[in-house]
């Protein structure tokens, strides 16, 4: 029977090292069985290389094509093969479809003046041209209540977002996640980071204390707790 | 230590033929794009063709576009120039040059970093 | 197709100074920042030639440090600092950046 592409390709690059290509055919599919994606970047001299392509479904297919570092020149010419049928052609410039990379190592921490602190890691290297350009998106939620969820924006450099404990529910379980984007390449967002839980302790009258001196009060406690059920 | 010996220059009548060769040793040659230039008596350097590392890719002047094909052998580490239709105005010195290195997904550029000592072709009734 | 112009065509130094050489080219050679596609070449007499500068500015293995390439889009030049009389011959640009490849006329170095 004959092969066609219901959905033609689309592509994203991570503007350093991974362009993915993704396609849906119009009936189930063996994608690396059936078909191939050819890529050649339009540069004097470059060879064409071949993507096996993998199932994300039944009938869409998803390739991973390992790039050089970016740059805003490069165009490559795309060719989707099902044997000797040439399935569909097209280009795809990197630096017009740009999906940043996921950020990293999202953890909270207490800090002073009874905030949490949020810190991630920029995926990018310095020497990127990325690297300077991201500005993220944290969504914190409520564990147990759906409708209570805020959305933080975060224009600057630092990788950091400062969160008063007052704004969330005291003794309240809360998830962040973060995602990125680089305006200036009009880029989609990144997928989002995985998340990271933890507990808000805020009540009014500790507003005289630290969040560390809440902690270590905490810490008391169970150790307290912890050693009197030791004895009996 | 890099090398490239080039061969097959003649004395050739003109609307003749006539293949070079350029074998090639001390660098991985089927991870480079291999070019031939040519030099007129007293003239100037004139490019000519580049094909790259896989043989895959291949470019040619407008000068000898159609009259000139260039080929390699991987496995005897050789390029060639085959010559048909030759003219007066190809006499010339011919060099063979490493050029960039095409195995990665943009080819890395380093020039023409090496060059062969040339052959010398006549065309001449 | 690009063309690539060289001036002046001959030059004649004295053994210590500096010679410049200027190359243009009819199109930006430039594909992305830091990646100019423009190399500068040296023959001497009875020789093959000999790569000095790729990329607009980055010195081949082996090559003095007295080379020294410079600029971007379509305008470059060789500097040839404190010049020995081993520096005469002819010195070519050429562009790498499409096909047809291409070279300058050449510049003819005399030392005085």
């Known amino acids: 029977g004959s092969v066609k592409v219901l959905h033609e390709p689309s592509c994203f690059s991570d503007y350093i090292s991974t362009s993915v290509c993704q396609w849906k055919m119009d009936h189930p599919t063996n994608c690396s069985a059936e078909l191939r994606l050819s890529y050649q970047l339009d540069f004097m001299g470059s060879e064409n290389h071949t993507c096996v392509p993998e199932n994300r479904e039944d009938s869409v297919c998803v390739c991973s094509m390992p790039i050089d570092d970016a740059v805003e020149a490069d165009v490559y010419q795309l060719d989707l093969w099902a044997g000797q049928q040439l399935l569909w052609s097209g280009s795809f410039q990197p630096s017009k479809h740009v999906k940043p990379r996921t950020p990293g190592n999202l953890t909270v921490h207490p800090n002073i003046s009874h905030t949490w602190l949020l810190m991630w890691t920029n995926p990018y290297p310095t020497e990127n041209h990325l690297h300077s350009e991201l500005t993220y998106m944290v969504n914190v939620s409520n564990d147990n209540d759906p409708e209570d969820f805020k959305v933080y924006n975060v224009t600057y450099m630092g990788p950091t977002l400062r969160l008063a404990a007052s704004t969330l529910k005291s003794g309240a379980s809360y998830s962040a996640r973060v995602r990125a984007w680089a305006q200036t390449y009009n880029s989609t967002w990144s997928d989002w980071s995985p998340s990271t839980t933890w507990l808000n302790y805020y009540e009014p009258w500790e507003q005289h204390l630290g969040l560390n001196d809440i902690f270590e009060a905490q810490k008391i406690e169970w150790h307290e707790h912890h050693h009197h059920h030791h004895h009996h | 230590e890099v090398q490239l010996v080039e061969s097959g220059g003649d004395l050739v009548k003109p609307g003749g033929s006539l293949r070079l060769s350029c074998v090639a040793s001390?660098?991985?040659?089927?991870?480079?794009?291999m070019d031939w230039v040519r030099q007129a008596p007293g003239k100037g350097l004139q490019w000519l063709s580049l094909?790259?590392?896989?043989?895959?890719?291949?470019y040619y002047a407008d000068a000898v576009k159609g009259r000139f094909t260039i080929s390699r052998d991987n496995a005897k580490n050789t390029l060639y120039l085959q010559m048909n239709s030759l003219r007066a105005e190809d006499t010339a010195v011919y060099y063979c040059?490493?050029?960039?290195?095409?195995?990665?997904?943009?080819?890395?550029?380093?020039?023409?970093?090496?060059w062969g000592q040339g052959t010398l072709v006549t065309v001449s009734s | 197709d690009i063309v690539m112009t060289q001036t002046p065509l001959s030059l004649s130094v004295s053994p210590g100074e500096t010679a410049s050489i200027s190359c243009r080219s009819s199109?930006?050679?430039?594909?992305?920042?830091?990646?100019?596609?423009l190399d500068w070449y040296m023959q001497k007499p009875g020789q093959s030639p000999q790569g000095l500068i790729y990329?607009?500015?980055k010195r081949a293995s082996g090559v003095s440090d007295r080379f020294s390439g410079s600029g971007s889009g379509a305008d470059f030049t060789l500097k040839i600092s404190r010049v020995e009389a081993d520096d005469a011959g002819v010195y070519y640009c050429?562009?790498?950046?499409?096909?047809?490849?291409?070279f300058g006329q050449g510049t003819k170095l005399e030392i005085k």
């Open positions: 990329l607009g500015s």
């Open positions: 050429m562009q790498g950046l499409q096909s047809p490849l291409g």
């Open positions: 094909i790259s590392g896989s043989g895959g890719k291949t």
């Open positions: 040059a490493v050029d960039r290195l095409t195995k990665t997904i943009r080819p890395q550029y380093y020039g023409l970093w090496s």
């Open positions: 199109q930006s050679l430039t594909y992305s920042i830091g990646y100019n596609y």
């Open positions: 001390g660098f991985p040659f089927r991870d480079y794009a």
